[in-house]
């Protein structure tokens, strides 16, 4: 079942999952010039069984011409939201090391991808903080947030972090410093 | 909680526009699509259109093609939809749609009338 | 564009029963194929995504099954309250389209 919002937003902080639940959807976002193609899902759905689980559909961008009908307040620039490649490239790493039986594991990039990622979760699905560089967290508890449903509505767990000014970026669970991760399992790619 | 709360009902005369709008809440208004579907008896649901906010992109049933604009504000979280040259076959219900689909507006009736 | 044809218009069922409500694509659309519920007066509500996953909130009555070209919405246990029209519709490839609905009568 579909969690009704998005993970809670945190100051200084971004969050991500170790793996995605079946059922979790992943826009088919693309970035600036890019637009989806015609045929084809808007989304890529996390589906299989509980011994083999795997993203179906792909997403594909292909180049537009199409006419801004949005009024955009402030200009939002590429360079602000660029995401390192090499960054997304030791991340992927870790993503294959993640097998969780009902799980898919972080779905490759594909061509002119937007820079952030666009997910809907589903009950059951833990996502994982940390903070931002230049902010070191103050825990008063996990750092981590639960989608679970509560009488028949959704909602998502408050974390326990806290960022505040400083040179040195915390890390996130399975990375140099461990933070209470179950397993420890290594980590899949930022989606905020 | 999210919420697409829709413009009130509109009489119009047959040959004029109309606009409405969906104001969107309880969700990053520029992250997801934001659809409109046409309702009327005895027609089903037709899908007009989508827009997304964060890059002004759109998508229209060909049908609607000169019919329909879509256009978004995102500081106001606001998507509308603008019908031209309305006739009595342009009477219906017309709902926004976010998320996937997940979420509908409670939708706003068009009266074309003279 | 894809054709989705719901051939029954109306389908009448009692409490208690069990009832199948079918959608077929003209063409191939993978699994991706929703359903949703409309009372009167209301605007429609999603119950199924990627053909057979609920959405937050559906009771676990309802389940959506198929892929490519045949999909069907089940109703076990039919209540009262599941009296409304329900649709389906591919998202596969634009344009977006719909059954044209099945109504469900409670005997």
């Known amino acids: 079942e579909l969690c009704d919002d998005d993970p809670p937003k945190i100051t200084h902080a971004t969050f991500k999952a170790v793996a995605y639940k079946e059922g979790t959807m992943l826009n088919c976002e693309c970035k600036r010039g890019f637009r989806r193609i015609k045929s084809g899902s808007p989304y890529m759905l996390c589906t299989g069984n509980s011994s083999h689980s795997s993203w179906d559909n792909q997403c594909q961008c292909t180049s537009s011409a199409a006419r801004n009908t949005t009024k955009q307040v402030t200009p939002q620039p590429e360079e602000q939201k660029e995401r390192k490649t090499t960054e997304m490239q030791s991340q992927m790493q870790l993503a294959d090391q993640v097998s969780l039986p009902g799980h898919c594991r972080e779905p490759p990039p594909w061509e002119n991808e937007a820079t952030e990622r666009i997910y809907h979760f589903v009950v059951g699905q833990t996502v994982y903080y940390q903070c931002v560089q230049g902010y070191r967290a103050l825990h008063r508890g996990p750092a981590e947030s639960v989608c679970k449903m509560t009488h028949g509505k959704t909602r998502w767990t408050q974390p326990q972090l806290i960022c505040t000014g400083e040179t040195e970026p915390s890390q996130f669970p399975g990375e140099e410093e461990p933070q209470a991760s179950p397993d420890g399992l290594p980590e899949s790619e930022t989606s905020r | 909680q999210i919420q697409l709360q829709q413009s009130g009902a509109e009489l119009v005369r047959p040959g004029t526009s109309v606009k409405m709008s969906c104001k969107a809440a309880?969700?990053?208004?520029?992250?997801?699509?934001i659809g409109w579907v046409k309702q009327r008896p005895g027609h089903g649901l037709e899908w007009i259109g989508d827009i997304h906010p964060g890059g002004g992109y759109t998508n229209y049933n060909e049908k609607f093609k000169g019919k329909a604009t879509l256009t978004a504000d995102t500081s106001s979280s606001t998507a509308d939809m603008q019908l031209s040259s309305l006739t009595s076959e342009d009477s219906a219900i017309y709902y926004c749609?976010?998320?996937?689909?997940?979420?509908w507006g409670q939708g706003t009736l068009v009266t074309v009338s003279a | 564009d894809i054709v989705m044809t719901q051939s029954q218009k109306f389908m009448s069922t009692s409490v208690g029963d069990r009832v199948s409500v079918t959608c077929k694509a003209s063409?191939?659309?993978?699994?991706?194929v929703a359903w949703y519920q409309q009372k009167p007066g209301q605007s429609p509500k999603a119950l199924i995504y990627?053909?057979?996953y609920r959405y937050s909130g559906v009771p676990d009555r309802f389940t959506g099954s198929g892929s490519g070209t045949d999909f069907t919405l089940t109703i076990s246990n039919v209540q009262s309250e599941d009296l409304a029209e329900y649709f389906c519709q591919q998202y596969n490839s634009y344009p977006y389209t719909f059954g044209g609905g099945t109504k469900l009568e409670i005997k």
């Open positions: 063409q191939n659309v993978g699994i991706n």
């Open positions: 749609t976010s998320r996937n689909f997940a979420y």
């Open positions: 990627s053909a057979s």
């Open positions: 309880g969700y990053t208004f520029t992250n997801y699509w």
